[in-house]
Interface confidence: low
């Protein structure tokens, strides 16, 4: 008898999910000597254990604790780059400025980046057909809970000056409902973090507005100030030039405003 399967609103588990996670883990630990001790098979077992046989709307941060423990990693706490709605540029930046780190430059972030996964209650199967959508189905799904957990831990680890890259092309440059707005902002530790510096990335070539004056940025400033953390903001008018100058700071054109 065919077994009835819950149909969720979101896409199913990324194909070859187990192989992808394992391959990413091996690659990461090969290239990062400080993580050479990590046993990737154990990492996969812990990852799998967080969601297999569990109802995909009833996942908790506790489910991911074994994985968090295995993936414990020390990154320089004063070299953290957060981002919201502008992942590609943030990653291009840390690939050039290799002493700064986004969450996806850490092992756990790297493993899960751009992947989807979920299981089914009481079976050991991975659901490749559909997974819960955060809005339409439930927020306590395996992917959302994972990113909430690792994002909270990443923000808690930050110190000194923390940078965040924000997308100046969006209607809400700072969105309280994003992972940055709902998780990371509230888990920066005021006793460790002195300043949050926002980099607002402009989209249009001729856009010379001061987006640091945007109402949503003022809202971010207010939230941060209330948490006894200083706030500063910079416009990045030319993201292409910004990246080029990070690569090649001696270039004569890089002394002007970017």
């Amino acid at each position: 008898v065919p077994r009835w399967r819950q149909q969720w609103s979101g896409p199913g588990t990324t194909k070859r999910f187990p192989e992808t996670v394992l391959a990413r883990c091996v690659k990461y630990t090969e290239i990062h000597p400080e993580m050479r001790h990590v046993d990737c098979q154990s990492v996969w077992d812990a990852f799998k254990g967080a969601f297999i046989s569990k109802h995909p709307c009833n996942i908790t941060e506790e489910d991911y604790q074994p994985l968090m423990k295995l993936g414990t990693q020390t990154v320089p706490c004063n070299k953290i780059l957060l981002w919201s709605r502008i992942k590609d540029l943030a990653h291009q930046f840390t690939q050039v400025q290799r002493d700064m780190f986004t969450l996806e430059d850490t092992l756990l972030g790297y493993l899960a980046d751009d992947l989807t996964w979920c299981g089914e209650f009481n079976t050991s199967k991975i659901n490749y057909q559909s997974c819960p959508d955060w809005r339409k189905d439930c927020s306590n799904n395996p992917v959302s809970v994972f990113w909430k957990t690792v994002s909270r831990r990443f923000a808690e680890a930050a110190c000194d000056v923390v940078h965040v890259m924000l997308n100046g092309s969006r209607s809400k440059i700072f969105d309280k409902n994003s992972t940055f707005g709902s998780v990371e902002v509230h888990n920066l530790q005021p006793e460790k973090v002195q300043t949050l510096e926002a980099w607002v990335i402009h989209g249009g070539r001729e856009d010379s507005r001061d987006l640091c004056q945007d109402p949503t940025i003022k809202e971010l400033e207010s939230i941060i100030s209330k948490r006894n953390i200083q706030f500063s903001c910079k416009n990045i008018y030319r993201p292409d030039k910004f990246l080029q100058c990070v690569k090649n700071p001696e270039d004569s054109s890089c002394t002007s405003e970017i």
């Epitope: 090969e30 290239i31 990062h32 000597p33 690939q95 050039v96 290799r98 002493d99 690569k247 090649n248």
Partner: nanobody, 126 residues
Framework: QVQLVESGGGLVQPGGSLTLSCRAS????????IGWFRQAPGKEREAIAC????????NYGDSVSGRFTISRDNAGTTVYLQMNSLEAEDTGIYYC???????????????????WGQGTQVTVSS
């Protein structure tokens, strides 16, 4: 399997030239500064050259500066070490390795290098 393979070594007379190649297998070198190291008989492995992520910036150890040139190809698969005016003191096993960082501001960054290959033997002798 992520690995780097060094090649191009050999026996050469003093004053001669060699070009070493460092080829990546299993990953791209694009996002890493790459260093060349050498280990002379009975000595510690030393950093001799580094090229950053852009290919624009290079650093050399004092012992090879002006004689060796490091470069990288555009495909992101190979880094070269052109060695001119070779001396007997250049004899050793030559290794390449990717750095964690994009820049080459210092050569004493052994701990940020990983994935050592087998190396390639260079012997300078008449």
């Amino acid at each position: 399997q992520v690995q780097l393979v060094e090649s191009g070594g050999g026996l050469v007379q003093p004053g001669g030239s060699l070009t070493l190649s460092c080829r990546a297998s299993g990953f791209t070198l694009d996002y890493y500064a790459i260093g060349w190291f050498r280990q002379a008989p009975g000595k510690e492995r030393e950093a001799i050259a580094c090229i950053d992520i852009t290919g624009f910036h290079t650093n050399y150890g004092d012992s090879v500066s002006g004689r060796f040139t490091i470069s990288r190809d555009n495909a992101g698969t190979t880094v070269y070490l052109q060695m001119n005016s070779l001396e007997a003191e250049d004899t050793g096993i030559y290794y390449c390795a990717p750095a964690r960082y994009a820049a080459c501001s210092a050569l004493d960054v052994k701990l940020s290098f990983t994935s050592w290959g087998q190396g390639t033997q260079v012997t300078v002798s008449s």
